[in-house]
């Protein structure tokens, strides 16, 4: 298989020239680094901050949408060390880690008016902010918390460059005073779990003070990674030695505690995933080690299987793991160059950004009972990094995804096996992201994100689909690089997608094309199961060609057909003529073959010999519907392009046209009549229709109406029965 | 930049008052609590007392609670600490502080800014 290439489709968006300014202002001021991140919520925001400046762009346009300047308490300005996105009583914000002279701030920034409005000292020196929860009280809500937790409201898990574990009273409760951050409230530090939190945050609150419990002291060793896993209720801590801690925040005790494979490497980012059906309450978490700018060169994917013995559907909808049973390292990867084939020795490799994606089948598409705890059918992971190799100017970087349900079915192995690459992987897939570098550079990449909604396999090119059709190497999706000067827009496009393009472009050499085409698409899995163990050789070019138009209509590729019959047309290549009666004698076979399998498939819903339609049969009756319809955007491009045609073919292309229309329209209302259940038809007519598939006023009201209308304009001449 | 520079400490005899005294700067005392921490020799940093922005709410350590007041001038800019029957066991270092991390015996952990400092000696 060939590399798969990430294309640009955007030029640079840039920042403002305010925003570039003011990021600009203190780079010459050696703590002060620029650091840049998507914001993980829905908001579409990324954040940028560089010394005691923080601007807040839209992650799409690039457009400012926030910015601040934050003020220190003595001659040295703070510096901006940690941004996480928070949302709280219909407020959107950001929690705010400041670096100070002494110590540190916790701030809760609202991005509606740009301002701080609360503030609270910390110890030491802040690495990482997660939001644990955005309110508080004994609700329903906050049951999965440990009892003293839920007096507080709002809480923020903070952690520090000598190792404390501090959880922190947002003290969301009183927002009556507007703090800015040189007005930062004190804080009081709670070692144990005591028994009367209610009435000591009372006390404590009086006194102008936020409460927090300590569940790590100072060790020494700093935190290098922060999250909290909603679903299985732990704060997963990464620590700068390759340690990795999970804490539950319903016992407030550490679960697990183990040194990656890597070794004294820190763990650098944590992102959880859980598979489709998994009977043993099994999900994961992936921990990444990365020496990341600093001395060394490692950057390895660690997967880390969680057991739990139970999971549960909250009322809220929300799925809960509990009762760790086991956590074990299941598989590894290392991205340090040897996994795929590198030209030059690599010198430094960064993680630049990392992110899960899941997606839940639709409703009615679900057989599950209805308080059943529903699991993503789709579970990916996607990893970008950037490799710099000794003596080249620009580095590379590569996007990965792994998609657990296909690892699953590869048998869960616990690495690449011998002579496997990444980019031959049937559970991970790599993209080269080569188009980006050589469009954005020299400007850095600070971080890479995803959009969810826009990742998709496309349309099965056939029923089953093969077995390529499910690889991750078969995914289509948008994102989005956040650089130090704006935003670019990246398509990446399977193999599948990107085969289908490249037929596209062929045009009118397609002749000559013809083999090369054929072998893509049996590759990328786009061909009939039929063709997969038939020899190329023994099949003629026509029947090559039939199963690349084949593959072209099952995908809905039909720009590709369509633009194929537009040049032939206008082009007038040697071989046009026929290509265009070969195609039209094709498409118009295919109308006929469809027709009948649709016809044989409707048999029951007529013949009163069923009740109900199995998923599968509707499937197919849809994929018919699907080919008809394409079909017939085919003949109306002929119809419509047609030239220099005598009248005898310009009748005959019509009615082609004209009948698969109305075949079409056809399929359309019978697939309607079986969404509304009324169809199939039973013989026993007294069976009462669950609920009327139809509006009856509003049809009555409709018709009323244009009888009125008809007798109207026939002057009492119509009549109406 | 905010500053806080302490004066008013001194010797004194055991059962004598003292009146201490935090000139603040750079920052609105309306907006802000401020505290007095001290350290007596070979100690750590103890909390003493402190007044919140809105100057009605104060609090003390139960080791001095009745003996000292704290109050503020906004006018002047300053917050005071009145000493009425001092102990031996009162003698230290004292600080004007803001942005305190403390544990719940109150002993201090660290400070976000401080003075330099005013000496307090009880001795008879």
């Known amino acids: 298989m060939r590399d798969l290439r990430a294309q640009v489709t955007s030029g640079l968006l840039p920042f403002p020239e305010v925003t570039l300014q003011a990021l600009g202002e203190d780079e010459i001021t050696l703590e002060s680094v620029l650091r840049g991140k998507f914001a993980a919520g829905k908001n579409g925001l990324a954040c940028l901050a560089c010394g005691p400046q923080l601007e807040v762009v839209n992650s799409i346009t690039g457009e400012r949408l926030s910015a601040y300047r934050f003020s220190g308490v003595n001659e040295q300005p703070p510096v901006v060390l940690a941004v996480k996105e928070f949302s709280w009583q219909k407020r959107t914000g950001l929690l705010i880690g400041l670096e100070e002279t002494e110590g540190s701030v916790l701030c809760l920034y609202d991005l509606g008016i740009s301002k701080v409005v609360k503030a609270v000292v910390l110890p030491g020196r802040v690495t990482a902010i997660e939001p644990i929860i955005n309110h508080g009280g004994a609700s329903a809500s906050t049951q999965h918390l440990h009892p003293s937790l839920r007096w507080l409201f709002g809480v923020a898990a903070v952690v520090t460059d000598v190792g404390q574990i501090l959880l922190v009273d947002l003290c969301l409760d009183d927002l009556s005073c507007n703090q800015n951050e040189v007005e930062a409230s004190d804080l009081e530090v709670l070692t144990g779990i005591p028994a009367e939190v209610p009435h000591i945050r009372e006390s404590v609150m009086r006194q102008g003070r936020h409460l927090c419990f300590q569940l790590v002291s100072p060790t020494g060793t700093a935190v290098s990674t922060l999250s909290y896993i909603s679903r299985t209720n732990q704060l997963a801590v990464g620590f700068s030695d390759g340690y990795l801690a999970l804490w539950n925040m319903k016992s407030m005790k550490r679960e697990y505690y183990i040194q990656l494979e890597s070794g004294q490497v820190p763990v650098y980012a944590v992102t959880f995933q859980e598979p489709e059906n998994d009977p043993r309450n099994c999900c994961y978490l992936w921990a990444v080690q990365s020496t990341q700018d600093s001395e060394g060169d490692v950057l390895s994917l660690h997967l880390l299987q969680l057991a739990f013995g139970n999971r549960k559907c909250l009322a809220s909808g929300q799925i809960l793991y509990e009762g760790l049973e086991y956590c074990e390292e299941r598989y590894t990867l290392d991205l340090t160059g040897g996994m795929f084939p590198l030209r030059g020795q690599t010198s430094n490799t960064k993680l630049l950004g990392c992110q899960s994606i899941e997606k839940f089948r639709s409703h009615g598409d679900r057989e599950e009972g209805v308080n059943e705890a529903l699991s993503p059918d789709t579970s990916v992971s996607v990893f970008t990094w950037q490799v710099n190799i000794y003596g080249q100017g620009k580095p590379s970087v590569y996007l990965g995804l792994f998609d657990i349900n296909r690892w699953y079915h590869a048998q869960m192995p616990d690495s690449l096996r011998s002579g496997e690459y990444l980019h031959n992987c049937s559970y991970f897939a790599l993209w080269s992201l080569e188009s980006v570098v050589s469009r954005t550079s020299p400007h850095g990449i600070l971080d890479i994100l995803v959009h969810e909604r826009s990742l998709n396999r496309g349309v099965p090119p056939s029923y089953p689909p093969p077995e390529q059709f499910f690889n991750p190497s078969t995914y289509n999706f948008d994102a989005t690089c956040l650089l130090n000067s704006g935003v670019v827009h990246l398509t990446c496009t399977g193999f599948q997608k990107e085969t289908l393009t490249f037929l596209k472009k062929s045009g009118p050499s397609l002749n000559e094309l013809i083999p090369d085409g054929y072998n893509r698409c049996l590759v990328a899995g786009l061909l009939s199961p039929r063709f997969v163990d038939v020899q190329p050789s023994s099949l003629s070019q026509e029947e090559q060609l039939e199963a690349i138009l084949s593959a072209a209509i099952q995908t809905s590729s039909l720009g590709l057909l369509t633009g194929y019959i537009r040049r032939w047309i206008t082009e007038e290549q040697p071989n046009s003529a026929t290509n265009l009666r070969f195609v039209l004698e094709w498409t118009w076979n295919k109308v006929v073959l469809t027709k009948e399998e649709f016809d044989r498939l409707c048999v029951p819903l007529f013949d009163g010999s069923c009740h109900f339609m199995d998923p599968q049969t509707i499937q197919s009756i849809q994929q018919c519907y699907l080919l008809l319809s394409n079909l017939n955007i085919v003949l109306s491009c002929f119809a419509s392009e047609a030239r220099e045609i005598t009248e005898r073919g310009l009748i005959d292309l019509s009615n082609k046209f004209v009948v698969s229309h109305l075949i079409c329209q056809y399929a359309q209302v019978v697939l309607w009549f079986s969404h509304s259940g009324l169809l199939p038809e039973g013989i026993d007519d007294s069976v009462q229709l669950s609920r009327l598939c139809y509006n009856y006023p509003v049809i009555q009201n409709y018709y009323t109406s244009r009888r009125q209308k008809f007798e109207r304009l026939s002057r009492g001449k119509w009549n109406p029965d | 930049q905010v500053q806080l520079v302490e004066s008013g400490g001194g010797l004194v005899q055991p059962g004598g008052s003292l009146r201490l005294s935090c000139a603040v700067s750079?920052?609105?005392?309306?907006?802000?609590?401020v505290s007095w921490i001290r350290q007596a020799p070979g100690r750590g940093l103890e909390w003493v007392s402190k007044?919140?922005?809105?100057?009605?709410?104060?609090a003390y350590a139960a080791s001095v609670k009745g003996r000292f007041t704290i109050s503020r001038d906004n006018a002047k800019n300053t917050v005071y600490l009145q000493m009425n029957n001092l102990k031996s066991e009162d003698t230290a270092m004292y600080y004007c502080?803001?942005?305190?991390?403390?544990?719940?015996?109150?002993?201090?952990?660290?400070?976000?800014?401080r003075g330099q400092g005013t000496q307090v000696t009880v001795s008879s």
């Open positions: 502080a803001q942005g305190l991390v403390q544990d719940s015996q109150g002993l201090v952990l660290s400070s976000r800014i």
């Open positions: 750079g920052v609105d005392l309306s907006r802000v609590g």
């Open positions: 007044i919140l922005n809105n100057g009605t709410n104060t």
